[in-house]
Interface confidence: medium
């Protein structure tokens, strides 16, 4: 039933698959870069403008014609903190999720010319300005270099770099993906005197190898080899160093001082998981055991007389979990007060909700400054008077986000700065503060169209609207758009939230097919108040399909009781809860229980496959894109966080009980589409290859699609269009839609 009565009465067009694939209706962003406490840069028609936050007036910082003769397409730019130089990035070549190589040139803004001497080499892996002035640190061929002046020769800091073996100042694959979410492993001190860096050693890490087919003319495919530690395999080791960039000499090699991990870490495999400068001469390091329920923060001070860094055992802070793992994905970062003698950090409280705790560096215990059956998402700014944070407290909605400030002299004085600004349109905020938090940009991303506004911290006054997407609003008035329902069901006296993208003219007396869009990984959230234009918008608007998502056990931002429910048991409760959610949805009266499908990508592909292989009888069909199929195939840091080690003494039994392959027989009852990119460096093609083999071995007929040379995102323009077109055909066929 497509609700055609309503559709015929409404002459407006629907949001089509082409609209999604061609991005017909574009959400406008307002991406600013703060350069001081009252100024920001904003790119408009390729001119870089500098805006005064208080008054809103702007001037051209750099006109788009400046680089007309440059001869390269500029991918990105970065202005030195003193405003004297601009770093231009070009020849961008993507590597993994965050990493890339590029070429760089430096433009002198005073002389209005490019610096041609002592240029940064091509294929540089990372570059960063010092926080003040215009020093540069960069990584090339896995070694670190520092430039004190852009036009002078570089000082070489390390000499040990070796491709795929020793990484100085950059992360290896697993640290990039699972620990730092960045390629950079360099940390400047606040005034740019010291440069801290990590060194990763992958000598013993096994390689994942896969073919890359490249151009048709390549007779023999290339083999890509990446050091990639799978669950239980040999991990990279890490060392940490600090170098004083004020004492670099062209005569002698730079002296890097090592800071060793705490003794409680050195007894076994461990990770470096956070680096935060507290003051000019104080640094905090967080270390995490390979079994990720125990972490230690070291606070280390510079001793000028010896040139060494001392980390007092009395200042160590231990964070551990008895119910799961430390942090949401890793221990949270500390936010130090100006004197560096205390800090604020998000940790789990006694009730298992993540809140802000105030630590003094010499004391073990901390004082919680927030509390409640909700969670602090992030600390956004710290001034002498206030701490600003984002939480999901408002109206008890875990899928909402609002900005709060708490008075440091009286923790009972908490103000929500965003809750009532635009309560209907805006329930999901993020924020960007100016350098000293005098001003802030609020970015509202839903449930209405995105809205960007500028505010003053002095009186929390709204200064101006930066972007309201009014042009898009006008366009969408002529489109039959779906609506989004956010609600919860109660299972075993616990609230579990879901969202439904409902077709236009939704009528609860009619029956609609339902597609369950699943991720369901630890600390995930799919039910929220964000506005999106995506594949689900098309399915609901044009095909009259309800697209639902459900946050069951294992999901985040609702306390550890829910999140840690799947500890050591991936592939159990989070899978069962998706099946139960579909059962609950089919009882709501408007779902055609003969036409329920499920789909997911990555962890969602794993859950989709486990659900379809459960033999529940609830689902007619499903699509798994780039799924995990067996946890021993996935990386050590992510997998072991939740599953422990695949050894008989630890959790091998559950590793073996949680595979998709073991459920192959049950796929005879469903229609299954399996999709994977052949060059997936993250969830290896191996994972789908093994599903396919197991299904073939038991005689299951299924559909499959590979995407040659595509990685985990299957994001190249042609592949993106192809996969969504292919999945649309599959879903329409499954639901018997014309």
């Amino acid at each position: 039933n497509k609700g055609t009565d309503d559709a015929t009465a409404d002459s407006r067009k629907t949001y089509t698959l082409t609209d999604y694939l061609k991005n017909t209706y574009r959400l406008k962003l307002y991406s600013l870069r703060w350069i001081s406490d009252h100024e920001y840069l904003y790119k408009q028609e390729n001119n870089i403008l500098v805006f005064n936050a208080e008054y809103g007036n702007s001037s051209v910082f750099l006109e788009n014609s400046t680089f007309d003769e440059f001869g390269h397409s500029i991918n990105d730019y970065s202005i030195s903190p003193d405003g004297q130089f601009i770093l231009l990035e070009y020849n961008y070549v993507k590597q993994w999720r965050h990493s890339y190589t590029a070429s760089y040139d430096i433009y002198d803004l005073n002389k209005r010319q490019l610096i041609t001497e002592e240029r940064i080499p091509n294929n540089t892996q990372w570059v960063t300005w010092s926080p003040v002035g215009h020093k540069l640190a960069y990584v090339w061929n896995n070694d670190i270099y520092v430039k004190i002046e852009p036009n002078l020769p570089s000082y070489r800091i390390t000499w040990t770099g070796k491709e795929d073996i020793i990484y100085n100042g950059i992360t290896d694959w697993v640290y990039e993906e699972e620990v730092f979410s960045a390629y950079s492993a360099l940390w400047w001190s606040p005034n740019g005197t010291f440069l801290a860096y990590a060194q990763f050693n992958d000598t013993e890490v096994p390689l994942i190898e896969y073919s890359f087919y490249s151009d048709e003319s390549l007779q023999y495919p290339k083999t890509v080899r990446v050091p990639y530690p799978k669950a239980g395999a040999v991990n990279p080791t890490v060392k940490f160093f600090v170098v004083n960039t004020d004492s670099l000499s062209s005569v002698t090699n730079a002296t890097s001082i090592q800071i060793t991990a705490p003794a409680s870490m050195l007894i076994g495999d461990h990770y470096l998981c956070d680096v935060t400068w507290a003051t000019q001469e104080r640094i905090s390091l967080q270390w995490l055991r390979r079994i990720q329920n125990y972490s230690v923060m070291d606070i280390c001070d510079y001793d000028e007389s010896s040139g060494r860094w001392n980390c007092l055992v009395a200042r160590q802070h231990i964070e551990m979990s008895t119910t799961g793992w430390v942090g949401r994905f890793r221990p949270s970062e500390p936010h130090f007060t100006l004197d560096g003698n205390s800090f604020y950090k998000i940790i789990s409280n006694e009730e298992g909700y993540r809140h802000i705790c105030y630590f003094q560096i010499d004391k073990k215990d901390c004082t919680f400054i927030t509390k409640g059956t909700w969670e602090v998402i992030g600390i956004e700014a710290l001034t002498s008077d206030y701490l600003y944070y984002i939480s999901n407290e408002y109206k008890g909605m875990p899928g909402g986000r609002n900005l709060y400030k708490i008075q440091l002299s009286d923790y009972t004085k908490v103000t929500c700065l965003s809750c009532e600004l635009n309560p209907e349109r805006c329930q999901y905020y993020s924020v960007s503060f100016s350098k000293e938090a005098k001003y802030y940009q609020l970015r509202c991303s839903g449930p209405g169209l995105p809205l960007y506004t500028l505010h003053s911290s002095v009186n929390d006054k709204g200064l101006r609207v930066l972007e309201d997407n009014s042009a898009l609003d006008k366009m969408l008035q002529n489109v039959q758009m779906p609506s989004k329902k956010l609600d919860f069901i109660i299972l075993n006296e616990t609230k579990f939230w879901y969202q439904m993208i409902l077709p236009p003219h939704f009528d609860k007396s009619k029956k609609y097919p339902l597609l369950l869009d699943v991720y369901a990984g630890p600390c995930s959230q799919k039910a929220d108040t964000v506005f999106r234009l995506n594949w689900a918008t098309y399915l609901a608007s044009t095909e009259n399909i309800i697209v639902a998502s459900f946050d069951g056990r294992g999901s985040g931002y609702q306390g550890d009781k829910i999140m840690h429910a799947i500890n050591r048991r991936l592939g159990t409760f989070e899978v069962e809860d998706q099946i139960e959610a579909a059962r609950q949805f089919s009882k709501m009266g408007f779902v055609d229980n003969k036409r329920i499908a499920i789909w997911g990508w990555s962890y969602g592909g794993y859950v989709t496959s486990m659900v379809l292989g459960s033999g529940s009888g609830v689902f007619k069909c499903g699509i798994a894109v780039a799924p995990v199929s067996r946890w021993e195939y996935y990386d050590s840091v992510y997998t072991e966080r939740y599953m422990g080690l695949p050894t008989p003494e630890d959790n091998l039994d559950h590793y073996r009980n949680s595979t998709v392959m073991s459920r192959a027989e049950n796929f005879k009852q469903v229609e299954y589409l399996l999709i994977h990119g052949t060059a997936d460096d993250n969830v290896h093609f191996q994972q789908s290859a093994q599903i396919s083999k197991a299904l073939v071995d038991v005689g299951v007929d299924f559909q499959a699609m590979w995407y040659t040379d595509e990685d985990h995102g299957i994001a190249s323009s042609t592949a993106h269009q192809h996969i969504y077109t292919h999945m649309s055909h599959f879903i329409k066929q499954c639901f018997s839609l014309p």
Epitope: P423, E424, R425, S483, K485, F488, T529
Partner: antibody, heavy 120, light 106 residues
Framework: EVQGVESGAELVKPGASVKLSCKAS????????INWVRQRPEQGLEWIGW????????KYNEKFKGKATLTTDKSSSTAYMQLSRLTSEDSAVYFC?????????????WGAGTTVTVSS | QIVLTQSPAIMSASPGEKVTITCSAS?????MNWFQQKPGTSPKLWIY???NLASGVPARFSGSGSGTSYSLTISRMEAEDAATYYC?????????FGGGTKLEIK
Amino acid sequence: EVQGVESGAELVKPGASVKLSCKASGYTFRSYDINWVRQRPEQGLEWIGWIFPGDGSTKYNEKFKGKATLTTDKSSSTAYMQLSRLTSEDSAVYFCARWTVVGPGYFDVWGAGTTVTVSS
Amino acid sequence: QIVLTQSPAIMSASPGEKVTITCSASSSVSYMNWFQQKPGTSPKLWIYSTSNLASGVPARFSGSGSGTSYSLTISRMEAEDAATYYCQQRSSYPNTFGGGTKLEIK
């Protein structure tokens, strides 16, 4: 079925107070705003304020501050509105209404209304 | 506060006739909701988030608009549509309702 059942009609004297109730059923009471709306005879609708039973937080229309006080009793899933220092101007039908979050949200369930007559 | 002005205040329409009720806001709002009220009953949600029909509302109704100008349209008037219609905004506090449009059948 989701519904809000309001207390019966009230006849009160000027200067007195009255406490209206709205008993909710069929949903999780603590998770949705309860709003109160006034409709004077032959007139339009005026929003008084909301209370969120989850934490007891409230938001009032400035016009009704000091006039209306909103409270809830979670154990009985009941919302209350106390109206004080009543005058003939306060004679009206008072509705409770649930605010639901579907996209930007809306008043989806209304009580039948309680008629308050202020007369000496 | 945002003032919502509905027009016309009263109108009558013949069966099958197209009806448009407008709601003008004193400053820009993100969305408009519409309610139908018949004598002696509580208001009923009719259109939410500007253009979405509430459950059970006939497809002859539609809503549109943005900024300060919104409307509710009935493509073909029927006797059961006779009622008072109110627009309502919650983009900024306080929530406000329009004065209502009383729609009668000829």
